[in-house]
Amino acid sequence: VDLTLLANLRITDPQRFFLTCVSGEAGAGRSSDPPLLLEKDDRIVRTFPPGQPLYLARNGSHQVTLRGFSKPSDLVGVFSCVGGAGARRTRVLYVHNSPGAHLFPDKVTHTVNKGDTAVLSAHVHKEKQTDVIWKNNGSYFNTLDWQEADDGRFQLQLQNVQPPSSGIYSATYLEASPLGSAFFRLIVRGCGAGRWGPGCVKDCPGCLHGGVCHDHDGECVCPPGFTGTRCEQACREGRFGQSCQEQCPGTAGCRGLTFCLPDPYGCSCGSGWRGSQCQEACAPGHFGADCRLQCQCQNGGTCDRFSGCVCPSGWHGVHCEKSDRIPQILSMATEVEFNIGTMPRINCAAAGNPFPVRGSMKLRKPDGTMLLSTKVIVEPDRTTAEFEVPSLTLGDSGFWECRVSTSGGQDSRRFKVNVKVPPVPLTAPRLLAKQSRQLVVSPLVSFSGDGPISSVRLHYRPQDSTIAWSAIVVDPSENVTLMNLKPKTGYNVRVQLSRPGEGGEGGWGPSALMTTDCPEPLLQPWLESWHVEGPDRLRVSWSLPSVPLSGDGFLLRLWDGARGQERRENISFPQARTALLTGLTPGTHYQLDVRLYHCTLLGPASPPAHVHLPPSGPPAPRHLHAQALSDSEIQLMWQHPEAPSGPISKYIVEIQVAGGSGDPQWMDVDRPEETSIIVRGLNASTRYLFRVRASVQGLGDWSNTVEEATLGNGLQSEGPVRESRAA
């Protein structure tokens, strides 16, 4: 976060003193962002309340100034500036020591690594012969005897420091005003030297010019006056901010200003200045913030206290140790492809002496527009410039050019950019198959825009529903099975196509309405009985273990294995438990099972029953007639059936009292050559019905029925008796 808190130490009059907080964040001060906050933080260092309330003056959305101090004590303590939005919201702290304090810090901000030893040193400004108390965040920490001063300094040594050791430390003479304390700020990075990230397993980029590696994100927090991902570039004198975009006010430039940056940097003088008031210029051979850096220029380079070594022509490098050579753009793709509306990052790498830097690399669009790099990565053998391209249009298709220019010369490389339009379906997806809880869908649809199709996203939800769409990403070449749906429910299904690359997702296509099937009929019937009622007739009964929750009827399946034929009988009445199957093939072995069905779905089958139908018999005997012989005898005569299906084994005669309710009686004529029979033992004056059929392998059809009455008024007979003979 680009946030700087400035204190102008040249101003000693409290009434003129002010603090300024500057945010250089891109898009800072958007209406949705919280405003910058600048205030005195009294939680640790408490002073008397100011004579009048401090007031904030805002200069636009990215700068705020705190004024209104009335007496020196108002200035002593901790000030904080808070800026940035959301997860990037950052607090910058400034610790102000009283110029008239008894004790004064040799160095206010100490940034150390986890596990390091930190030494806080307070030099005596106005001596008192009392003990010195050290405090951490306002709580007692340690006591030193006044005679323990070493060379006029009291030191606190903290070994193996850990992040919780961070905070505000103070050294105070016993019984002296807290305003006379030396206040320090200790910042302990969450990792050891050169490491960052969770578990501290990642390597820092190697921050230059006194930059400090952030232990959470690995970025370099650059000292005021330096920029670049590794703080490798010096700003022009008097400039600061992450991109050198801010300028120190007034003619004195950055003299007398203390700059406080986000942790783990802390505070320092601006580049080229040092001392407790930041008013001392660097000694020869030194440069940078607090003049902490040494030039050590070679090959005739001169030391500039703001930027370091200034190299003569033909040399470059931190110490002018590298000779120049013509820059060269390293391997680049000759053709790249982006999707319309995206804002791609295009990288261009170059080598050369001097090393290409941020401003030396540019990107030219087909319309002649020049883009400057937004980020530069410096590696030992190359500089890679990253260009953030504004939203692409079809007009951006064409030849782009990367250009590099240094004091060693220039180079350029052309490459072709193709801007593609993401695909949008023109048709709805197709339903291939359905079940009660799933739909099989073909997602392949015709589309507008550019291929190839890299992924297909299918969205579906119940018809007329306002719930969120369920999404499934599928292979474009395969059919999709939508699972765990509700039975008998309509679903809207639509497709979104994507092509390769960022922003390759096209819009939604038209939706199709697809309806799931009924729920399965889960009950299994049991076959209870089956009776042959004739050569081609079968009565079947079945049961169900309970009342079906869903079912439209039953399907009886008869499998004739010998002929490889299946007959299906649909009983479209779910309450049915019996059925008469007719028109079967006589003499056939059938395997029979029954299932419950619902809509088009079949439930589990019953165990199969094996049924053997008898073969069919011969046709009916012809010309049957009857003649009464006495009061107890009637003679029956007939002719053989026409074209019997084989040799007749016997005839069966059926006798029944006309109009009676009793069961009929049957008589076998075991000699098939006989076609006449005298039925004896009948009742006198009684009318009888007769019919006859032949048997070959199976029973044949009945003949016509004839009626005849016995004569006279004789005795009741025990029942009919037969006597037969050939006609």
Epitope: W526, L601, P604, A605
Partner: antibody, heavy 120, light 107 residues
Framework: EVQLLESGGGLVQPGGSLRLSCAAS????????MVWVRQAPGKGLEWVSV????????GYADSVKGRFTISRDNSKNTLYLQVNSLRAEDTAVYYC?????????????WGQGTLVTVSS | DIQMTQSPLSLSASVGDRVTITCRAS??????LAWYQQKPGKVPKLLIY???TLQSGVPSRFSGSGSGTDFTLTINSLQPEDVATYYC?????????FGQGTRLDIK
Amino acid sequence: EVQLLESGGGLVQPGGSLRLSCAASGFTFSMYGMVWVRQAPGKGLEWVSVISPSGGNTGYADSVKGRFTISRDNSKNTLYLQVNSLRAEDTAVYYCARAPRGYSYGYYYWGQGTLVTVSS
Amino acid sequence: DIQMTQSPLSLSASVGDRVTITCRASQGIGHYLAWYQQKPGKVPKLLIYTASTLQSGVPSRFSGSGSGTDFTLTINSLQPEDVATYYCQQFNSYPHTFGQGTRLDIK
């Protein structure tokens, strides 16, 4: 508590016969279909036979059709498997299990099994 | 008869792994499928019935899915006590055939 207890297993010569029984308790026996499942030593499960609650409807695996007969006596809460013409490959633990009444297709209740060994 | 084919026939996995066993029917069987677990010397135990319904008392790391011809048993985070042989069985039509079984052990 539903319990199924098989008995009748033992050593028998090829071509011999046995009658396996399964005594059921803890549920209304006449309301449930019953099955026999077998498992040869070190091998997988093999479905053998089923009988309907009334006993009128039976089914068999092809490997035992014509040799095994399943029956039940609802008055005695007992399931039977008459095994004839035994072969070496019929050596297995024979389990009886209660068939589902519908909806929940799976055998939840099993007996502990009875071992049939066919060997000369 | 409907054939049930399980794959793999054996597999080794580490504790905490996600394990998937598949069962394929030679013809469509709707949702009429059960999964069993059998430990050595023990009676089979019903895990999943009607393809995806978890039997009461079975840990929720077990789940079943599929319909028609392709079915899956998934163990979300393998535990040492899950070492066993797993069988599928179809209930669509008689004979109610089982798969060959999948032997699962711990690496």
